[in-house]
Interface confidence: low
């Protein structure tokens, strides 16, 4: 499948609109600080060049790889060293090292201003004045803040973003129509970004084998009627797609994702009965729909797993002949029978099975040695079940905000060295597991909860990797991908932590808190809670609750006062003094 000109090939496959959008995403994900206008200029230059290659694939430079073409273009940015510092050194390297260098400089937490949403009329005017620029700006702003966002999926978000403005800017009540849609896109976008970040971390930190194992388990749950060979083919193709996107090869990724969707729809009879509706949709919607499709029903006549994987005298022979294929079959067979298990649990079971075979197939009596291997699974299954049961009970008792606060305290005590904004962000997201998953029946709780927690804990891991401050976080993040959550769950209070010095400024609040949204006000209060725990890690739940209740009452009182600022100054001092006394600071 060699093409004389790769850039011409991708331009023709994807079409001009998608080509330009994907190049913009790629450039914004690499050079996250560059102004929008600079990126648009670079994209236009690349697009014009691609058109010359479409016209004549033998034209000068058309035979160059996409990395070479894109890298050369990025390295023409005049302010590279001033803006990006050592990232400019990447430009002295040759491909493929140059691209690897750019990838290593992607920043998960770029120092960019928060996106502030303008008034609806202002947005609608901008949309009508120049729709193309308006939508490009959306792609640019999301891509630079989320450098691992799944590019073909971002095209789908942009399509929905455009549809929202097209519909709502004509509506009688523009705001009522538009704002809920934008909120939904924002929340879904954050979730999509975090899920993709875990896929990229899995590939980049733990390798292709780890990603393939995850994919075997998930696709086997989703397509339990598909044969192992079919699932294996889908896993191979899916791995290629995500390897490309995580590696910055966005044109190839989008092209291959479209091919995979086409294959799945052409072969849905041997994959899943749930794909019919998805396959009737246009390309971007189709790919999204397939990625989110519900699990098919389990086949009726699945035999006992024990026959092939425990009772058979050929277990060690089969394992020795093709270890990864045999383990893949085990994972496939176990996962298709267990839509009620999280993917990470299934991977832990497969790891336990692999470890047992490694040990037993070298023993004098292998069968005797591995005969009880399924008994070892019981505690592994019960641990997340019990944890989810306890936490859902706590969530139902406390509600989301107070449940988040309980987790804030829990995680601050475990890893108090982590920055306060990171602890607040991660704990708030951990707390959302309650409203997201506890409503489900038991059969859906574990896959919902534990796989979601894997995504959130990966956020902690990638943010911590940028500025490592805690050996415990590093250990949990790097030792085992599938045991990250149990590792963090097992952490107790960090007894080595030296409490933070008390700083009254941290607990000084102003009248501006009164105009904040409920969410922003919660974040302020939760920030204060983390700081309290960092000052007094041994504070009891009751002490912390008392202080937080006083704090909430103080904010409410001063926000109702005529002279708010004076109230915050005077009452704030009293609150700090009372809190210090209550906590023995």
């Amino acid at each position: 499948d060699a093409h004389k000109s790769e850039v011409a090939h991708r331009f023709k496959d994807l079409g001009e609109e998608n080509f330009k959008a994907l190049v913009l995403i790629a450039f914004a994900q690499y050079l996250q600080q560059c102004p929008f206008e600079d990126h648009v200029k670079l994209v236009n230059e690349v697009t014009e060049f691609a058109k010359t290659c479409v016209a004549d694939e033998s034209a000068e430079n058309c035979d160059k790889s996409l990395h070479t073409l894109f890298g050369d273009k990025l390295c023409t940015v005049a302010t590279l060293r001033e803006t990006y510092g050592e990232m400019a050194d990447c430009c002295a390297k040759q491909e493929p090292e140059r691209n690897e260098c750019f990838l290593q400089h992607k920043d998960d937490n770029p120092n960019l201003p928060r996106l502030v949403r303008p008034e609806v009329d202002v947005m609608c005017t901008a949309f009508h004045d120049n729709e193309e620029t308006f939508l490009k700006k959306y792609l640019y702003e999301i891509a630079r803040r989320h450098p691992y966002f799944y590019a073909p999926e971002l095209l789908f978000f942009a399509k929905r973003y455009k549809a929202a403005f097209t519909e709502c800017c004509q509506a009688a009540d523009k705001a009522a129509c538009l704002l809920p849609k934008l909120d939904e896109l924002r929340d879904e976008g954050k979730a999509s970004s975090a899920k993709q970040r875990l896929k990229c971390a899995s590939l980049q930190k733990f390798g292709e084998r780890a990603f393939k194992a995850w994919a075997v388990a998930r696709l086997s749950q989703r397509f339990p009627k598909a044969e192992f060979a079919e699932v294996s083919k889908l896993v191979t193709d899916l791995t290629k797609v995500h390897t490309e996107c995580c590696h910055g090869d966005l044109l190839e990724c989008a092209d291959d994702r479209a091919d995979l969707a086409k294959y799945i729809c052409e072969n849905q009879d041997s994959i899943s009965s749930k794909l019919k509706e998805c396959c009737e949709k246009p390309l971007l919607e189709k790919s999204h729909c397939i990625a989110e499709v519900e699990n098919d029903e389990m086949p009726a006549d699945l035999p006992s797993l024990a026959a092939d994987f425990v009772e058979s005298k050929d277990v060690c022979k089969n394992y020795a002949e093709a270890k990864d294929v045999f383990l893949g079959m085990f994972l496939y067979e176990y996962a298709r029978r267990h839509p009620d298990y999280s993917v990470v649990l299934l991977l832990r079971l497969a790891k336990t099975y692999e470890t047992t075979l490694e040990k037993c197939c070298a023993a004098a009596d292998p069968h005797e040695c591995y005969a009880k291997v399924f008994d070892e699974f019981k505690p592994l299954v019960e641990e997340p079940q019990n944890l989810i049961k306890q936490n859902c009970e706590l969530f139902e008792q406390l509600g989301e905000y107070k449940f988040q606060n309980a987790l804030l305290v829990r995680y601050t005590k475990k890893v108090p060295q982590v920055s306060t904004p990171t602890l607040v962000e991660v704990s708030r997201n951990l707390g959302k597991v309650g409203s997201k998953c506890c409503k489900h029946p038991e059969a859906k709780r574990m896959p919902c909860a534990e796989d979601y927690l894997s995504v959130v804990l990966n956020q902690l891991c990638v943010l911590h990797e940028k500025t490592p401050v805690s050996d415990r976080v590093t250990k949990c993040c790097t030792e085992s991908l599938v045991n990250r959550r149990p590792c963090f769950s097992a952490l107790e209070v960090d007894e080595t932590y030296v409490p933070k010095e008390f700083n009254a400024e941290t607990f000084t609040f102003h009248a501006d808190i009164c105009t904040l949204s409920e969410k922003e006000r919660q974040i302020k209060k939760q920030t204060a809670l983390v700081e309290l725990v960092k000052h007094k890690p041994k504070a009891t739940k009751e002490q912390l609750k008392a202080v937080m209740d006083d704090f909430a009452a103080f904010v409410e009182k001063c926000c109702k006062a005529d002279d708010k600022e004076t109230c915050f100054a005077e009452e704030g001092k009293k609150l700090v003094a009372a809190s210090q006394a209550a906590l023995g600071l």
Partner: nanobody
Framework: EVQLLESGGGLVQPGGSLRLSCAAS????????MSWVRQAPGKGPEWVSA????????RYAESVKGRFTISRDNSKNTLYLQMNSLRPEDTAVYYC????????GSQGTLVTVSS
């Protein structure tokens, strides 16, 4: 704890009918395929019929095809086996199982077909 409780067995004449029920508890019934298995006196277990978790896909052993019908009611966590045109060779202890695995310790219900 997984529990499967069969009922509906009894003595019936050849050509007669019976409806067996299996009440399930201790697991998420609606997520699993289920089967009926029978064991005649002095013989090993024989798989009779299976149904997928949603109830759309059903399978039967050749010996019962056209006479037996498997069904389920996920809202009641119950599996059924409607047995028509019964024959003496259908005499056995019938028990329900999860998937197509061996018995999960259920007691079974005795079906005797005799004139």
């Amino acid at each position: 704890e997984v529990q499967l409780l069969e009922s509906g067995g009894g003595l019936v004449q050849p050509g007669g009918s019976l409806r067996l029920s299996c009440a399930a508890s201790g697991f998420t019934f609606g997520s699993f395929g289920m089967s009926w298995v029978r064991q005649a006196p002095g013989k090993g277990p024989e798989w009779v019929s299976a149904i997928d978790s949603g109830g759309a896909d059903t399978r039967y052993a050749e010996s019962v095809k056209g006479r037996f019908t498997i069904s389920r009611d996920n809202s009641k966590n119950t599996l059924y086996l409607q047995m028509n045109s019964l024959r003496p060779e259908d005499t056995a202890v019938y028990y329900c199982t999860i998937g197509r695995s061996a018995s999960r310790g259920s007691q079974g219900t005795l079906v005797t077909v005799s004139s």
